[in-house]
C-alpha cells in the first residue's frame, strides 16, 4: 500500500515537473515572439521602402548605425509606453552597448533636460533577473544602478547617465527604437 | 474626423479656480489615457497632466502640482481639469488630447485668462 502511495506520489511529482517545463517553454516562447515580430517589422519597412528614396528614419527620430530612436514627448507609466512604441512599429530600447548607452545619453542631453525615460528593460517577477523585452539578460555593465524597494513590478529606466529602476507604474517619457531602413540606392 | 471640443475657460482674479472640460465627437475617450496641454503667447505648447484611460492614475506638471486635478467621466466620455489657486502665469489657451505619440487633431482650446 505504501509503496502504491509512493508510486502515485513520484507520478504526480514528475507530472509538475513537466508542466513547470511547459510553461518555461511557453515564456521563452512569448518572449521570442516579441523578437522575431521586432525583426519581421523592420523587415517589412525596409521591403516596403525600397522602392522609394526614403530617409533610413522617420520624421523626429534619430539615427545612430542601424537604429532609429524617438524620445517621446509624452509621459506612460512602462506597459503604455511598449505599446505606444508598438504603434509605430518600434520597442522600448534596448541598450546592447555602452557606445549605444553613450549615444543615447549625449543624445537626451541636447534634447532635453535631466528626465526620466523608460527603457525596454523590467525585472522578472519570480527570479528577480532584468530582462530586455526580447528575453535577453543586460550585459553586466547594463544593470540598473539601484534596485527599486517597491513591492510591485520593476522595470527600468535612463536619467542623465544612469540606468535606474522604478515601480512600473510610474510616469515617465520614453525612448522607442527601431532599425533604420537601409539605402535602396 | 475626430474633433475634440474644449471648454470652460474665461477671466478670473488670481487665486480663483475655473473648470475646463473635454468631449470628443465620433470618437469613444474611455480607452485612451487623455492630457490636458497649455500654450501662452509667444511660447511653446507644454504638457500639463495625464490621465490613463481607467482613471485611476494620474500625473501633472511641476508648476501645477497640488492646485490643479485632472478627472474623467467615462459614462459622459469627457475628461477634465480642475484649476484651483490660478496664477497670472497661468494664462494661456488649454487643450486636450490623446496621450499618444500619434496625437488626434487639435481642437481650438478654450482661453485662461487669470489677471492679478
Known amino acids: 500500500k505504501l509503496l502504491q502511495v509512493s508510486t502515485i506520489a513520484m507520478q504526480q511529482q514528475e507530472k509538475l515537473i513537466q508542466q513547470e517545463r511547459a510553461l518555461l517553454n511557453f515564456t521563452e516562447w512569448k518572449r521570442s515572439c516579441a523578437l522575431q515580430m521586432k525583426y519581421c517589422q523592420a523587415f517589412m519597412q525596409n521591403s516596403l521602402s525600397s522602392a522609394h528614396n526614403s530617409s533610413p528614419c522617420p520624421n523626429n527620430w534619430i539615427q545612430n548605425r542601424e537604429s532609429c530612436y524617438y524620445v517621446s514627448e509624452i509621459w506612460s507609466i512602462w506597459h503604455t509606453s511598449q505599446e505606444n512604441c508598438l504603434k509605430e512599429g518600434s520597442t522600448l530600447l534596448q541598450i546592447e552597448s555602452k557606445e549605444e548607452m553613450d549615444f543615447i545619453t549625449g543624445s537626451l542631453r541636447k534634447i532635453k533636460g535631466s528626465y526620466d525615460y523608460w527603457v525596454g528593460l523590467s525585472q522578472d517577477g519570480h527570479s528577480g533577473r532584468w530582462l530586455w523585452q526580447d528575453g535577453s539578460s543586460p550585459s553586466p555593465g547594463l544593470l540598473p544602478a539601484e534596485r527599486s524597494q517597491s513591492a510591485n513590478q520593476v522595470c527600468g529606466y535612463v536619467k542623465s547617465n544612469s540606468l535606474l529602476s522604478s515601480n512600473c507604474s510610474t510616469w515617465k517619457y520614453f525612448i522607442c527604437e527601431k532599425y533604420a531602413l537601409r539605402s535602396s540606392v | 474626423d475626430v474633433q475634440l471640443v474644449e471648454s470652460g475657460g474665461g477671466l478670473v482674479q488670481a487665486g480663483d479656480s475655473l473648470r475646463l472640460s473635454c468631449a470628443a465627437s465620433e470618437r469613444n475617450l474611455r480607452i485612451y489615457d487623455m492630457a490636458w496641454y497649455r500654450q501662452a503667447p509667444g511660447k511653446e505648447r507644454e504638457y500639463v497632466a495625464v490621465?490613463?484611460?481607467?482613471?485611476?492614475?494620474?500625473h501633472y506638471s511641476d508648476f501645477v502640482k497640488g492646485r490643479f486635478t485632472i478627472s474623467r467621466d467615462n459614462a459622459k466620455n469627457t475628461v477634465s481639469l480642475q484649476m484651483d489657486s490660478l496664477k497670472p502665469e497661468d494664462t494661456a489657451f488649454y487643450y486636450c488630447?490623446?496621450?499618444?505619440?500619434?496625437?488626434?487633431?487639435w481642437g481650438q482650446g478654450t482661453q485662461v485668462t487669470v489677471s492679478s
Open positions: 490621465i490613463s484611460s481607467s482613471g485611476d492614475s494620474t
Open positions: 488630447n490623446v496621450n499618444q505619440i500619434r496625437q488626434w487633431p
